[in-house]
C-alpha cells in the first residue's frame, strides 16, 4: 500500500482581520493510525494550534467530522483572525504510540492577515499663513496589513506632487502605519479650498479612504484698503469712507485717526461675503470741515486677525471746496478722541 501523504493544497491563504481562516488538510491513507496536530511554524519553537486527540482550542473547529473512523479531511477553521495569527501552518500526522510520534508533515500553508487602514486624519499648521506662502499638511492612517499601501494628495481635485511618505515600521509587524507630509502653496482664492489625503489598500476593494482639511482654517488673506472722499449735501460736511476688501478670516478691527489722533475704533460685524469666501467691509466718517482751521489727515488703520496694523490715509483740504481726493501715506498709531467727526460702518 502507498505510504500516507499529508496534503495541504493551499500554499497561501489571505484573510481579513476578524474573519475566520480555513486551513485545508487531507491525508491519503488511514494507515498508520494516529492523530493529526496543527502547528504554527516548524522546528523546536513551533506552536500547537490544534490537537485532534486532546486539549482545549476554543478558536479552532474542524471542518469535517474528524472523529469518524474513515475521515481523511483534517481541515480546520480558526475564528476571529488577528494580524498576530500570520505565519505558516503545518498539518502533521502522528503515529499512535506511547508517546505518539511525528510521522509526516504537510508542506505548510502561509496565512496572511488583511487589516483595513483607519480613516486618514489630516492636520494643518498651527498658525495661519498668507497667500504665496507654503504650508505643510500631515496625513496619518494606522492599523493596516499587509504593508503595501498607496497615498495620494489632492487640492480641489488636483493631485499634488510635493509630499513625503513613510510607512512604519520599516521591518515586519502585525500592522503598519503611514505618515505623509505635503507642501501646499496658498493663493488668495483658497478660502473655499480643500486638501484631501487619499489612502488605497488591498482591504478597501478599490474604494479609497479620504481625509480632508479645509484651507479656511489655515489661510489668512490680508485686506486691501481704499480711502475715498464722497461729496455730501451740506457744504461744510465731507463723507470719507474706508473700503476694506478681500479679507479672511472675519476678525478685524478698524480705527480712524485724525491727524494721528484716534477718533473711533470699531469691529467688523455686518460684512459682505465674496464668491471666493473672502469678506468686504466699509466704514465711513462724516467730517465737519468748518470745525477745522488747517488741512486734516484722515487715516484708516486696520488690525486684521491679530496681525500688525495696516493703514491708508486721506488728506482733506479744508480750505478748498469738498471734492473727491485721496492719498496713501503711513499713519501714526496714537491719538485721542476728536469732536466734530461722525462715523458709521456698513
Amino acid at each position: 500500500e502507498e505510504e500516507l501523504q499529508v496534503i495541504q493544497p493551499d500554499k497561501s491563504v489571505s484573510v481579513a482581520a476578524g474573519e475566520s481562516a480555513i486551513l485545508h488538510c487531507t491525508v491519503t491513507s488511514l494507515i498508520p493510525v494516529g492523530p493529526i496536530q496543527w502547528f504554527r511554524g516548524a522546528g523546536p519553537a513551533r506552536e500547537l494550534i490544534y490537537n485532534q486527540k486532546e486539549g482545549h482550542f476554543p478558536r479552532v473547529t474542524t471542518v469535517s467530522e474528524s472523529t469518524k473512523r474513515e475521515n481523511m479531511d483534517f481541515s480546520i477553521s480558526i475564528s476571529n483572525i488577528t494580524p498576530a495569527d500570520a505565519g505558516t501552518y503545518y498539518c502533521v500526522k502522528f503515529r499512535k504510540g506511547s508517546p505518539d510520534t511525528e510521522f509526516k508533515s504537510g508542506a505548510g500553508t502561509e496565512l496572511s492577515v488583511r487589516a483595513k487602514p483607519s480613516a486618514p486624519v489630516v492636520s494643518g499648521p498651527a498658525a495661519r499663513a498668507t497667500p504665496q506662502h507654503t504650508v505643510s499638511f500631515t496625513c496619518e492612517s494606522h492599523g493596516f496589513s499587509p504593508r503595501d499601501i498607496t497615498l495620494k494628495w489632492f487640492k480641489n481635485g488636483n493631485e499634488l506632487s510635493d509630499f513625503q511618505t513613510n510607512v512604519d515600521p520599516v521591518g515586519e509587524s502585525v500592522s503598519y502605519s503611514i505618515h505623509s507630509t505635503a507642501k501646499v502653496v496658498l493663493t488668495r482664492e483658497d478660502v473655499h479650498s480643500q486638501v484631501i489625503c487619499e489612502v488605497a489598500h488591498v482591504t478597501l476593494q478599490g474604494d479609497p479612504l479620504r481625509g480632508t482639511a479645509n484651507l479656511s482654517e489655515t489661510i489668512r488673506v490680508p485686506p486691501t484698503l481704499e480711502v475715498t472722499q464722497q461729496p455730501v449735501r451740506a457744504e461744510n460736511q465731507v463723507n470719507v469712507t474706508c473700503q476694506v476688501r478681500k479679507f479672511y478670516p472675519q476678525r478685524l478691527q478698524l480705527t480712524w485717526l485724525e491727524n494721528g489722533n484716534v477718533s473711533r475704533t470699531e469691529t467688523a460685524s455686518t460684512v459682505t461675503e465674496n464668491k471666493d469666501g473672502t469678506y468686504n467691509w466699509m466704514s465711513w466718517l462724516l467730517v465737519n470741515v468748518s470745525a477745522h482751521r488747517d488741512d486734516v489727515k484722515l487715516t484708516c488703520q486696520v488690525e486684521h486677525d491679530g496681525q500688525p496694523a495696516v493703514s491708508k490715509s486721506h488728506d482733506l483740504k479744508v480750505s478748498a471746496h469738498p471734492k473727491e481726493q485721496g492719498s496713501n501715506t503711513a499713519a501714526e498709531n496714537t491719538g485721542s478722541n476728536e469732536r466734530n467727526i461722525y462715523g458709521g460702518s456698513g
Epitope: 504554527r40 511554524g41 516548524a42 522546528g43 523546536p44 519553537a45 513551533r46 506552536e47 500570520a86 505565519g87 505558516t88 503545518y90 502533521v92 503515529r95 510520534t101 511525528e102 510521522f103 509526516k104 508533515s105 508542506a107 505548510g108 502561509e110 521591518g171 515586519e172
Partner: antibody
C-alpha cells in the same frame, strides 16, 4: 536576496557585556530561526543560541546564564548580549538564518553574515 | 548534548579525484518523520560557512552536484565526486535535530 550584517564594538573589556546586532535585509523575519554562532581564533564553530519569529529563544546550556538573544521585527534586527566576558570569548561572531519546514528539526543554516571579530582585552 | 565526531581531521586531495568525509553522532539523528537532521557546511579560508547539504542528503540551492550526502541514524558521509581547487577549506557537519545544535570538529581539505 537575503543578507545579514553584524554590527557592534570590536573590543570589549573583561567582565563587561558584549552587545551585537544583526540587521536582516532583503527578506522576511517570519518563519525562520535567527541564530548566533561563534568561532574562536583557529578553532571550530560553536552554536550560541537562536530566536524564532514568535520570540521563543533557545540557548546553548554552556552559555545560557550569560546570553540573551532578542528580536526586533519592526527594525528587521536581532541582537546578542553576553555578560561577564573573558578572554575566552574572543572570537568571530556570526549571525545566521536557520530554516525550518519539516517537523521538530531544522533544515539548514542557509544564510550567514560575514562575521564580526570581537576581542576581549583590557 | 549530541556529540559530533568528524574524520579525518585533515584531508589532502588531488584535483579531479574523489574525496570523502565521515561524521558520526552520539545518538540517532533520524526523527520519527523519516528525516535525518544533519547538515554539511564548507568554510573557505577567510569566509563565512556555506550550507552544502541538509537533512543528510538534500543539496542546498546553488551547490554543485559533485557534492553529495548520505547516511542515516548516526553515520553520515559527505562525498566530493571530483575535487576542484575552490573546494579547499574546512568542512563541518552539524546536527539539527535538537538544541543545542552541535558541530563536528571540522575536516581541513587541502590540495596535495
Amino acid at each position: 536576496q537575503v543578507q545579514l550584517q553584524e554590527s557592534g564594538p570590536g573590543l570589549v573589556r573583561p567582565s563587561e557585556t558584549l552587545s551585537l546586532t544583526c540587521t536582516v535585509s532583503g527578506g522576511s523575519i517570519r518563519n525562520y530561526y535567527w541564530s548566533w554562532i561563534r568561532q574562536p581564533p583557529g578553532k571550530g564553530l560553536e552554536w550560541m543560541g537562536f530566536i524564532y519569529d514568535n520570540g521563543r529563544t533557545f540557548y546553548n546550556p554552556s552559555l545560557k546564564s550569560r546570553v540573551t538573544i532578542s528580536l526586533d521585527m519592526s527594525m528587521n534586527q536581532f541582537s546578542l548580549k553576553m555578560t561577564s566576558v573573558t578572554a575566552a570569548d574572543t572570537a568571530v561572531y556570526y549571525c545566521a538564518r536557520v530554516r525550518a519546514y519539516s517537523g521538530i528539526g531544522l533544515d539548514g543554516t542557509d544564510v550567514w553574515g560575514q562575521g564580526t571579530t570581537v576581542t576581549v582585552s583590557s | 548534548d549530541i556529540v559530533m565526531t568528524q574524520s579525518p581531521l585533515s584531508l589532502p586531495v588531488t584535483p579531479g579525484e574523489p574525496a570523502s568525509i565521515s561524521c558520526k553522532s552520539s545518538q540517532s539523528l533520524l526523527y520519527s518523520n523519516g528525516y535525518a537532521y544533519l547538515d554539511w557546511y564548507l568554510q573557505r579560508p577567510g569566509q563565512s560557512p556555506q550550507l552544502l547539504i541538509y537533512q543528510g542528503s538534500n543539496r542546498a540551492s546553488g551547490v554543485p552536484d559533485r557534492f553529495s550526502g548520505s547516511g542515516s541514524g548516526t553515520d553520515f558521509t559527505l562525498k566530493i565526486s571530483r575535487v576542484e581547487a575552490e573546494d579547499v577549506g574546512v568542512f563541518y557537519c552539524m546536527q539539527a535535530l535538537q538544541t543545542p545544535l552541535t558541530f563536528g570538529g571540522g575536516t581541513k581539505v587541502e590540495i596535495k
